[in-house]
């Protein structure tokens, strides 16, 4: 996990300012409104999981 301004997050993850760490883009399926999801690859979202 890197701070913003240093090396980017690893592939498949994106920086969350809210959590102050890199987060898995895969979790955007369940939490599409998380701040870091904006930085994840723009793949079409899967159906939202209950």
């Amino acid at each position: 996990e890197q701070a913003p301004g240093t090396a980017p997050c690893s592939r498949g993850s994106s920086w969350s300012a809210d959590l102050d760490k890199c987060m898995d883009c895969a979790s955007c399926r369940a939490r599409p409104h998380a701040d870091f999801c904006l930085g994840c690859a723009a793949a079409p979202p899967a159906p939202f999981r209950l």
Partner: antibody, heavy 119, light 111 residues
């Protein structure tokens, strides 16, 4: 460092009640979803209940086997959450773990607490 | 509910060799991009510990001897080379939908 400290558990008679507690530290508790997972020799690891974060309207979900019997709740101001268990039966016996998840996997775990339902 | 079937229930592997554990889900737990399958290690008297998330992503701090693969319904956890400290029970878990379910576990013994 991250810690999930559990309390509660012990011996309870069939039909009785028990409340488990879990206090979190070392991470942004209010942003995480919290779950209870239990383990027994008969059923292995079994997810029991989940409470989501404020941004998800504190939505709760339960395993079918505990619906109407167990209630999960949280107190973000004190970084703690709870499992109120009522009408306990022998099949509820096991080790109960509190766990945090951002969305999918169980990242942090409590130390576990034993619950025995027996007369 | 999605049923997770783990095989074998137990295995014994010689020190330095490869351990392979399989997990099959009763329905697909993958999108075109990600698989919602995770692996844990549990030692006696301890809670489970996350090893692999999303089928193949190594959790921070977990040795590279552990690797995961698979998609759809069939997933594999590999440990190579196995070490004495790997003696434990290993579980798979899906997060495709509620209820989240776990496999029955695979007990690994090091010979």
């Amino acid at each position: 460092q991250v810690q999930l400290q559990q309390s509660g558990g012990g011996l309870v008679q069939p039909g009785g009640s028990m409340k488990l507690s879990c206090i979190a530290s070392g991470f942004t508790f209010s942003s995480y979803w919290m779950s209870w997972v239990r383990q027994s020799p008969e059923k292995g690891l079994e997810w029991v209940a989940e409470i989501r974060s404020k941004s998800d309207n504190y939505a709760t979900h339960y395993a079918e086997s505990v619906k109407g019997k167990f209630t999960i709740s949280r107190d973000d101001s004190k970084s703690r959450f709870f499992l109120q268990m009522n009408n306990l039966r022998a099949e509820d016996t096991g080790i109960y773990y509190c766990s945090s998840t951002y969305a999918d996997y169980f990242h942090y775990w409590g130390q576990g607490t034993d619950l025995t339902v027996s007369s | 509910d999605i049923v997770m079937t783990q095989t074998p229930a137990s295995l014994a592997v010689s020190l330095g060799q490869r351990a392979t554990i399989s997990c099959r889900a009763s329905q697909s737990v993958s999108t075109s991009t990600y698989s919602y399958m995770h692996w844990y290690q549990q030692k006696p008297g301890q809670p489970p510990k996350l090893l692999i998330k999303y089928a193949s992503s190594l959790e921070s701090g977990v040795p590279a001897r552990f690797s995961g693969s698979g998609s759809g319904t069939d997933f594999t956890l590999n440990i190579h080379p196995v070490e004495e400290d790997d003696t434990a029970t290993y579980y798979c878990q899906h997060s495709w939908e509620i209820p989240y379910t776990f496999g029955g576990g695979t007990k690994l013994e090091i010979k």
